[in-house]
C-alpha cells in the first residue's frame, strides 16, 4: 500500500504519500482553531505509471493509454485513498469545545 | 456537477470532464476486444481552485493551502467521480461473448 509506513521510509518517485505540515493561521488563514496550531496533513504526489496502485478499470486504461501516447494530457493522478480525522479544540465564547474534523489527514494514496 | 452535460457545452478552464476517444488497438494495444473498436472514455483535467467541486474536508484544506502557498506542489487533483460501464464483445474460441467492463467511462469529475 502507498501508505505512510512505506512512503515515508522510501525514496519512491511514483505516486506516494508525502509529508506536509499545515499551520492553520499561516497556511489557511484560520484563527478559530485553538489547538493544535497545525498538523501533519500530508499530500499525494508522483506519476502514475501503468500498474502502479491503480484505482479502477478506467485508471488502468488511462495509464495504458498514457504509455502509448506519452505526450497526452490524459493521465491518472495521485490522490488520497485513506483519510483520517483530526481532533481540534475551538472556543464557543469562553467555553472550549473538542471536535473531530473528518477526512483531514492523508494516510495513503492511489492513482485515480 | 462537473459532468458531460456541463463540461462538454462550456469552455470551463477549471477541473472538468474532457472528451477523449480511445482506440483499443492503437491506444492500448488490445486486440482481444472485437466490438467496439474504441470508445469515448473521456478524462478529467483542469486546476482545482478553492471551492471548486472539492471532494472532502481535506481537499478544501489543500486547495486553501495552495491559495496561500501558490508555488507549492501540494494541490488537489481533478479525477473521475462518476464512472459508467462499457459493454464489449470478445471471442472465446469462435464463440462471441458479451460483457460489461465496469468503471470504463468518465461521466463527471471532482477535485480530490
Amino acid at each position: 500500500a502507498l501508505d505512510t509506513n512505506y512512503c515515508f521510509s522510501s525514496t519512491e518517485k511514483n505516486c506516494c504519500v508525502r509529508q506536509l505540515y499545515i499551520d492553520f493561521r499561516k497556511d489557511l488563514g484560520w484563527k478559530w482553531i485553538h489547538e493544535p496550531k497545525g498538523y501533519h496533513a500530508n499530500f499525494c504526489l508522483g506519476p502514475c505509471p501503468y500498474i502502479w496502485s491503480l484505482d479502477t478499470q478506467y485508471s488502468k486504461v488511462l495509464a495504458l493509454y498514457n504509455q502509448h501516447n506519452p505526450g497526452a494530457s490524459a493521465a491518472p493522478c495521485c490522490v488520497p485513498q485513506a483519510l483520517e480525522p483530526l481532533p481540534i479544540v475551538y472556543y464557543v465564547g469562553r467555553k472550549p469545545k473538542v471536535e473531530q474534523l473528518s477526512n483531514m489527514i492523508v494516510r495513503s494514496c492511489k492513482c485515480s | 456537477a462537473l459532468d458531460t452535460n456541463y463540461c462538454f457545452s462550456s469552455t470551463e478552464k477549471n477541473c472538468c470532464v474532457r472528451q477523449l476517444y480511445i482506440d483499443f488497438r492503437k491506444d492500448l494495444g488490445w486486440k482481444w476486444i472485437h466490438e467496439p473498436k474504441g470508445y469515448h472514455a473521456n478524462f478529467c483535467l483542469g486546476p482545482c481552485p478553492y471551492i471548486w467541486s472539492l471532494d472532502t474536508q481535506y481537499s478544501k484544506v489543500l486547495a486553501l493551502y495552495n491559495q496561500h502557498n501558490p508555488g507549492a506542489s501540494a494541490a488537489p487533483c481533478c479525477v473521475p467521480q462518476a464512472l459508467e460501464p462499457l459493454p464489449i464483445v470478445y471471442y472465446v474460441g469462435r464463440k462471441p461473448k458479451v460483457e460489461q467492463l465496469s468503471n470504463m467511462i468518465v461521466r463527471s469529475c471532482k477535485c480530490s
Partner: antibody, heavy 117, light 102 residues
Framework: QVLLVQSGAEVRKPGASVKIFCKAS????????MNWLRQAPEQGLEWMGQ????????NYNGKFKGRLTLTADTSTNTAYMELSSLRSADTAMYYC??????????WGQGALVTVSS | EIQMTQSPSSLSASPGDRVTITCRAS??????LAWYQQKPGKVPKLLIY???NLADGVPSRFSGSGSGTDFTLTISSLEPEDAATYYC?????????FGGGT
C-alpha cells in the same frame, strides 16, 4: 539557523515591573507562536503565555491575569514579556521559546529576574 | 486546566539500563504531548514532540509512546550523559502545563 537571544539579568524590588525581550532570527517570526515560560530556582517549568506576532493575538495562563503583557515588534523580530506587581515568588529564569508542531522546539538562553527588597 | 502527573519523581539507574518515565494527563490530550530534557544550569531541550516523534538531533535511544491520557518516555540503553531532569508538557488547550519532572 533558528536563534532566540534574550536580554540580560534584571533585579527588581517587590511591586515593580520588568520587561524582557527576545530577538528572533532564522525563521518566519510573524507566522510562529512565541511562548514564554519560567522556572523558579530548583523548581519545575511553568508556561506563562504565548503571542502570535503576525497579528498580536495572545493566550495567557490565568495565573498571571492582569500582570502579564506580551507584545511583539515585527519590524525588529522581537518579542517582549512584561510582568508587573512583582513579588519574591516571581524570582525565576524566564524563557522565550518558539512554538512548532505541538512543542516548543527552540528556546532562548533565559533571562534571570531577581525580585528582592 | 489539564493536570500532568509524572512518575517516578526521581530514579537511579546504571549505564546500559532501559529506563521508562510515565506521564498521565487528567483528560484526553490525544497525541499533543512533548518531552524535554534539562541538565543543571542549562536550557530545556526538546526530545519528543507529538507524543512519538523524535526531535532533530536526538539520539534514537530515546522514544515516546502513548496517546489519550497515558504517555511514556523510554531510554533504551542509558548513557552517562542522560543524567538530567525530564519533563512532559501537554499542548491541548492553554495553559500548557508541565509534569513535575523526573
Amino acid at each position: 539557523q533558528v536563534l532566540l537571544v534574550q536580554s540580560g539579568a534584571e533585579v527588581r524590588k517587590p511591586g515593580a515591573s520588568v520587561k524582557i525581550f527576545c530577538k528572533a532570527s532564522g525563521y518566519s517570526f510573524t507566522s510562529s507562536w512565541m511562548n514564554w515560560l519560567r522556572q523558579a530556582p530548583e523548581q519545575g517549568l511553568e508556561w506563562m503565555g504565548q503571542i502570535y506576532p503576525g497579528d498580536g493575538d495572545t493566550n495567557y495562563n490565568g495565573k498571571f491575569k492582569g500582570r502579564l503583557t506580551l507584545t511583539a515588534d515585527t519590524s525588529t523580530n522581537t518579542a517582549y514579556m512584561e510582568l508587573s506587581s512583582l513579588r519574591s515568588a516571581d524570582t525565576a529564569m524566564y524563557y522565550c521559546a518558539r512554538h512548532y508542531d505541538g512543542s516548543t522546539d527552540y528556546w532562548g538562553q533565559g533571562a534571570l529576574v531577581t525580585v528582592s527588597s | 486546566e489539564i493536570q500532568m502527573t509524572q512518575s517516578p519523581s526521581s530514579l537511579s539507574a546504571s549505564p546500559g539500563d532501559r529506563v521508562t518515565i510515565t506521564c498521565r494527563a487528567s483528560e484526553n490530550i490525544y497525541s499533543n504531548l512533548a518531552w524535554y530534557q534539562q541538565k543543571p544550569g542549562k536550557v530545556p531541550k526538546l526530545l519528543i514532540y507529538a507524543a512519538t516523534n523524535l526531535a532533530d538531533g536526538v539520539p534514537s535511544r530515546f522514544s515516546g509512546s502513548g496517546s489519550g491520557t497515558d504517555f511514556t518516555l523510554t531510554i533504551s540503553s542509558l548513557e552517562p550523559e542522560d543524567a538530567a531532569t525530564y519533563y512532559c508538557q501537554h499542548f491541548w488547550g492553554t495553559p500548557y502545563t508541565f509534569g513535575g519532572g523526573t
